[in-house]
Structures are given as structure tokens and as C-alpha cells.
């Protein structure tokens, strides 16, 4: 599941990693755009082994993965779901 959140919270990420995570290990991705209390874009990845990590938005692999997910979400495929949540 790929989610884009617009929140008024401060930055969530303490440290960002650029280490590649295979898609089969990923359960959910959350994108927090910059602004609203945090000066940078944040990408949070939930892994299937019940761990959670912040990924460097500049990492090539996450950019490619998000592009694939965006394309799929705009097609007729039922999964993964692209959720735009605006409180």
C-alpha cells in the first residue's frame, strides 16, 4: 500500500537509509510531503518482518519503486492501492 499523507506533525524520521529493500519485504509505504512542520519530504517503509525504516527520498530504488506503484495505481489493477489522505 502506498500512502500520501498531509499532516501538521513535525518530522517523524530520526535517520534515513538508502539501503535497498526488496519489494517482497515491503508491506506499506507512506509518503509525507515537505512542509506543515517538516522541511523535508519523508518516506516511511513498513517491512513484513515488523520493522519500520525511513528511506532517503533521493535513493534511486525508492524513486523507481514509487513510479511503478503510481503507474499501477492509475491503471485498472486492484493492488497496490494508492491512498491520498488529507485530514
Amino acid at each position: 500500500v502506498l500512502e500520501v499523507y498531509y499532516t501538521s506533525l513535525r518530522c517523524r524520521c530520526v535517520q534515513e537509509s538508502s539501503v535497498f529493500i526488496p519489494r517482497r519485504f515491503i508491506d506499506r509505504i507512506q509518503i509525507l510531503p515537505r512542509g506543515n512542520g517538516c522541511p523535508r519530504k519523508e518516506i516511511i517503509v513498513w517491512k513484513k518482518n515488523k520493522s519500520i525504516v525511513c528511506v532517503d527520498p533521493q535513493a534511486e530504488w525508492i524513486q523507481r519503486m514509487m513510479e511503478v506503484l503510481r503507474k499501477r495505481s492509475s491503471s485498472t489493477l486492484p493492488v497496490p492501492v494508492f491512498k491520498r489522505k488529507i485530514p
Epitope: 517523524r12 524520521c13 530520526v14 535517520q15 513498513w46 520493522s51
Partner: antibody, heavy 122, light 107 residues
Framework: QVTLKESGPGILQPSQTLSLTCSFS??????????VGWIRQPSGKGLEWLAN???????YYNPSLINRLTISKNTSNNQAFLKITNVDAPDTATYYC??????????????WGQGIMVTVSS | DIQMTQSPSSLSASLGDRITITCQAS??????LIWFQQKPGKSPWPVIY???NLASGVPSRFSGSRSGSHYSLTISSLESEDMADYHC?????????FGSGTKLEIK
């Protein structure tokens, strides 16, 4: 307000099965990212992680005790359970349940129960 | 399993002292370390998370740091309410493992 409370027998005999219940409020184990763990502490000693159960029924155990541990949950009753088979004197300890929420920043065991003292004695 | 070697096991210090407690990890755990405070007869409570971040409501005299595989909890000016046991926990990978604990007493 998040609260957790452990319940179970205060005393049991060697070779018996210890059954503990964690009753909680202020969160739900049906919510994505929520988990409950069990930790124990022999009197005057350090903490030992035993097991975790997550919203999706994923379970993790301490390998040193995995053959004796079973963790489970009843989501609708807001309860988590731990069973330890074939108990012996070294299992005498205070047993805690604690909440974990898989959010960023991730702080496992951010809320704890008051603990329950369990004594194994013949 | 990752072993967490905590020292000292006990520590006696005076009010106003600066004290440091250390945990050494047997494998790389990055910043995935928490310090818990446990007051007598009470349950543990997080004071530092992700190695160096102050948990909500914790006084600023508490701080955490890392040097290689060594992780430290420092109290800059000891107060009587800091008398407690302190435990480190690594949560980089299962099984989660705690240090053996440090009992902090006031002289």
C-alpha cells in the same frame, strides 16, 4: 489513555503451565501497526524479552524459550495471552505486558502494565 | 542473538554528579536502542529512544549517545528522583535483547 494490566496465577508448581492474560485499553490490536509483547524480570535481575504478537497475528518468540511459549490474542476483548509450559523455579519472575506501535519514530514497549509476580514452587 | 553488555551493574553517586551508563552491542544495531528507567516497585518507562532522542516528558539532563558499538546514557546533574534501575534494549532485530541493568543509587 493507554493502560495494560496482567493477570494470572500468583503461584504454581513445577511442570505446570503458566497462563497469563494482558487486558488493555486505549488501543486496539486490530489497528495496523499495533502489537503487544511480554517481558519478564526475576527479582533483583534484568529484563528478558519473551514474545510479541502483532495486529495481523504475526508472532515472534525468544529462541531460548520458543518450545515452551505460546502467544495469542483476542482482538474483540482487547486481550493478549501468554502460555509457558513445564515451568520451573527459574521461571519465577514478575511478568509484564507492554504495547508496541509500529509508527515512526518507533519506540517499542512505550506503555507497560504494572506487572504480575509469579512464583514457581513445590 | 545480539548480546548487550551493560556496565556498571551498580553505581552510587551524589546529587549533582554527572553519571554515565554504557551498553555494548555484540553486532551492529545502528541507532535501534532504547534506554528504560525503572523506579523501585514500578514498571520500566522509556527515557531515550533511537540512541539519542529524549522521550516525551523526560528532563533534559538525560541524554544518549553512541560511539561505535558502545551506547551511553548520561545524566548531567543527578537528582534524587533519578534513583532507579536503567536498562538498555536493542530492537534492531529479533530476538530483542536487554542489557543486564544498572542500579543507580544516591550517596
Amino acid at each position: 489513555q493507554v493502560t495494560l494490566k496482567e493477570s494470572g496465577p500468583g503461584i504454581l508448581q513445577p511442570s505446570q503451565t503458566l497462563s497469563l492474560t494482558c487486558s488493555f485499553s486505549g488501543f486496539s490490536l486490530s489497528t495496523y501497526g499495533m502489537g503487544v509483547g511480554w517481558i519478564r524480570q526475576p527479582s533483583g535481575k534484568g529484563l528478558e524479552w519473551l514474545a510479541n504478537i502483532w495486529w495481523d497475528d504475526d508472532k515472534y518468540y525468544n529462541p531460548s524459550l520458543i518450545n515452551r511459549l505460546t502467544i495469542s490474542k483476542n482482538t474483540s476483548n482487547n486481550q493478549a495471552f501468554l502460555k509457558i509450559t513445564n515451568v520451573d523455579a527459574p521461571d519465577t519472575a514478575t511478568y509484564y505486558c507492554a504495547r508496541s506501535e509500529l509508527v515512526m519514530p518507533y519506540v517499542p514497549f512505550d506503555f507497560w502494565g504494572q506487572g504480575i509476580m509469579v512464583t514457581v514452587s513445590s | 542473538d545480539i548480546q548487550m553488555t551493560q556496565s556498571p551493574s551498580s553505581l552510587s553517586a551524589s546529587l549533582g554528579d554527572r553519571i554515565t551508563i554504557t551498553c555494548q552491542a555484540s553486532q551492529d544495531i545502528g541507532i535501534d536502542l532504547i534506554w528504560f528507567q525503572q523506579k523501585p516497585g514500578k514498571s520500566p518507562w522509556p527515557v531515550i529512544y533511537y540512541t539519542a532522542n529524549l522521550a516525551s516528558g523526560v528532563p533534559s539532563r538525560f541524554s544518549g549517545s553512541r560511539s561505535g558499538s558502545h551506547y551511553s546514557l548520561t545524566i548531567s546533574s543527578l537528582e534524587s528522583e533519578d534513583m532507579a534501575d536503567y536498562h538498555c534494549l536493542q530492537y534492531k532485530q529479533y530476538p530483542f535483547t536487554f542489557g543486564s541493568g544498572t542500579k543507580l543509587e544516591i550517596k
